[in-house]
């Protein structure tokens, strides 16, 4: 029977979320309870790291939301967005794959505010590669698990 | 070994955006630089064509963006869509697979706007159908390979 | 040859689509005519039943819109949600795999408003799960087949 | 691009004092700022930020004494209940564009002595 | 919030210097470091832990992520005596400093 493939759900570990308008490597994700898992590769400080050559499909899932009862929001304009990095650990360097989400005006009357982004795409990566999120305003994260999470899952070998 | 399964991962080609605010198919992808690569598949005036039978799962990320500086947008309540077209050759006809997008009100104090759209689905492809891509506003296009980008790969055969 | 992999690509049964702003199960899709196909799954009473236990992606692409020739939007402030919902029949309970949305006010002076969602994620699923697709404000989805959809495929087998 | 800082001075305790950083060649649009000091002979010590519009983010220290406000090409410090732990080097740094809290232009410091 | 040990060196030019930086909690890899020489405001040197800021010769290095980094200058010259500081750039909630205590460079 063939090896398993690589594979990946990781979702938003929310005790760990971090506060501020700046942009942030997020730092902790879930990799085994709820519909958390991973397979052939490994998550360490909120980095997944690629153990096997291939080309895989690459997913994230970011969901804002605020409510006034938790005060004003940071900034009347907020730039909500989340960038898909792979960082090469031979050669120092972090480069954006995917990047996706919305500028927003949430000084409205309304008294509770949310925004999700997916993004998607399938990509080359090598073994010691690892794949991290960025996401602007992270204090206005949504903890869920099925709001905030990312993936990864090996479609096929390099070659 | 089997053969290796088609896919293609394209990135808009910066040079090439056209201007305007009409919807437009987006004539000009990379397939070789940066994370645009391509196997299996044709890229040909912007379309990609499928050359062996399947069902794939094809992909879009479409971003849009607007610096004040870069002059005012060209109406105060856009339409950012994105249309991921499947054009036959042999009868010549074309459909949409997917849609998305926002209506957006860009007029208002923020000197930057930004909006990005994410589509996914799994369609069952004939070798020779071509698949391209549509947009409204198109001068409004962010041109980094991380935003606006489409692709597909085969997941099975047919039967 | 290999037992073909379990799929779906099932779209909005326009016909049946309901009135309303709560938050609703849609119980009618397509899942043979246009993009509409299920192959190795269950389709009843608008729920995708897994038949084969395995790693499946399971996708969404979810889109409002409302023109002012059918009248006033419910509410200035608009929640357009979208849940996708396991269900396990053995032990009776549900829980949602991934949200997304946006929170809009569609009170402005644009005589046409549309949005769209999309989520994605890679999910253990066991025969007899099932898979369904919540909304809110269904009086608003867009009817058409490249709007409204949800789907899923069968990636790898469990162990 | 630069940053530059002024209103610096001598102030008794108790008084009250606002600083102001000026930047040119960049927006404040477009990058966030921060308010470091650093007294004489120690090390660095965050006070607290400002995004585009935003409301500002203080260190737990700073809260309720320190302001941070911002127009179109300044961003202020104001200080209230000044001591003489007060009394330090202020700097104004710009956050890096692409929105990550990475300090990558600084001034040159102004000067904070708080004294009877 | 940020410990940075040791707080002095001394290291002769040609050769390696590495110390070290703790954050109080798991910060992945949102660190930076700054370099100040007296009478100068600090300079950045690395951010993401590890990257390199424009015009920063390769002889800095930055590793580690989580709560542990290192900072490693190699042929060491006259001009890297300065204090070195680390900064937490994760989250503002519960900071008394983002900044650590410095760890000064002395060049012989």
């Known amino acids: 029977k063939p090896e398993a493939q690589p594979f990946a759900h990781l979702t938003i570990n929310a005790a760990s979320i971090p506060s501020g308008s700046h942009k942030v490597t997020l730092s902790s994700w879930y990799h085994d309870r709820g519909w958390a898992k991973i397979s052939n590769m490994t998550l360490s400080n909120g980095k997944l790291r690629v153990n096997q050559d291939g080309f895989y499909y690459l997913y994230a899932n970011i969901c804002f939301r605020h409510h006034e009862t938790s005060g004003s929001v940071p900034t009347d304009y907020l730039q909500l967005m989340v960038y898909v990095v792979k960082t090469s650990i031979k050669i120092p360097s972090s480069h954006n794959l995917m990047k996706g989400g919305s500028t927003k005006n949430w000084s409205g009357n309304s008294e509770f505010h949310f925004y999700s982004i997916n993004v998607g795409g399938f990509f080359k990566l090598r073994a010691g590669e690892e794949i991290s999120i960025q996401v602007s305003n992270p204090s206005l994260l949504d903890p869920d698990q099925d709001a905030t999470y990312f993936g990864a899952f090996k479609v096929q070998d390099i070659d | 070994k089997p053969e290796a399964q088609p896919f293609a991962h394209l990135t808009i080609n910066a040079a090439s955006i056209p201007s305007g605010s009409h919807k437009v198919t987006l004539s000009s992808w990379y397939h070789d630089r940066g994370w645009a690569k391509i196997s299996n598949m044709t890229l040909s005036n912007g379309k990609l064509r499928v050359n062996q039978d399947g069902f794939y799962y094809l992909y879009a990320n479409i971003c849009f963006r607007h610096h004040e500086t870069s002059g005012s947008v060209p109406t105060d309540y856009l339409q950012l869509m994105v249309y991921v077209v499947k054009t036959s050759i042999k009868i010549p006809s074309s459909h949409n697979l997917m849609k998305g997008g926002s209506t957006k009100n860009w007029s208002g104090n923020s000197e930057f706007h930004f909006y990005s759209i994410n589509v996914g689905g799994f369609f069952k492809l004939r070798a020779g159908e071509e698949i391209s891509i549509q947009v409204s506003n198109p001068s409004l296009l962010d041109p980094d390979q991380d935003a606006t980008y489409f692709g597909a790969f085969k997941v099975q055969d047919i039967d | 040859k290999p037992e073909a992999q379990p799929f779906a690509h099932l779209t909005i049964n326009a016909a049946s689509i309901p009135s309303g702003s709560h938050k609703v199960t849609l119980s009618s899709w397509y899942h043979d005519r246009g993009w509409a196909k299920i192959s190795n799954m269950t389709l009843s009473n608008g729920k995708l039943r897994v038949n084969q236990d395995g790693f499946y992606y399971l996708y969404a692409n979810i889109c409002f819109r409302h023109h002012e020739t059918s009248g006033s939007v419910p509410t200035d402030y608009l929640q357009l949600m979208v849940y996708v919902v396991k269900t396990s029949i053995k032990i009776p309970s549900s829980h949602n795999l991934m949200k997304g949305g946006s929170t809009k006010n569609w009170s402005g002076n644009s005589e046409f408003h549309f949005y769209s969602i999309n989520v994605g994620g890679f999910f253990k699923l066991r025969a007899g799960e099932e898979i369904s697709i919540q909304v809110s404000n269904p009086s608003l989805l867009d009817p058409d087949q490249d709007a409204t959809y949800f789907g899923a495929f069968k990636v790898q087998d469990i162990d | 691009q630069s940053v530059k800082e002024s209103g610096g001075g001598l102030v008794t305790p108790g008084g009250t004092l606002t600083l102001t950083c000026t930047v040119s060649?960049?927006?404040?649009?477009?990058?966030?700022m921060s308010w470091v000091r650093q007294t004489p002979g120690k090390g660095l010590e965050w006070i607290g930020y400002?995004?585009?519009?935003?409301s500002p983010y203080y260190a737990n220290w700073a809260k309720g004494r320190f302001t941070i406000s911002r127009t179109s090409t300044t961003v202020d410090l104001k200080m209230t209940s000044l001591t003489t732990e007060d009394t330090a080097t202020y700097f104004c740094a710009r956050h890096v564009s692409d929105g990550g809290w990475y300090l990558d232009i600084w001034g040159p410091g102004t000067l904070v002595a708080v004294s009877l | 919030d940020m410990i940075q040990t040791p707080a002095s060196v001394e290291v002769v030019v040609g050769g390696t210097v590495t110390f070290n930086c703790q954050a109080s909690?798991?910060?992945?890899?949102?660190l930076a470091w700054y370099q100040q020489k007296p009478g100068q405001p600090p300079k950045l040197l690395i951010y993401s832990a590890s990257t390199l800021a424009s015009g920063v010769p390769s002889r800095f290095k930055g590793s580690g992520s989580g709560t542990q980094f290192t900072f490693t200058i190699s042929d060491v010259e006259c001009t890297d005596a300065a204090t070195y500081y680390c900064?937490?750039?994760?989250?503002?909630?519960?900071?008394?400093?983002?900044f650590g205590g410095g760890t000064e460079v002395v060049v012989k």
């Open positions: 400002i995004y585009s519009g935003s």
């Open positions: 909690q798991n910060i992945g890899s949102n």
């Open positions: 060649g960049f927006s404040l649009s477009r990058n966030a």
């Open positions: 900064q937490q750039a994760y989250s503002i909630s519960n900071v008394d400093n983002a």
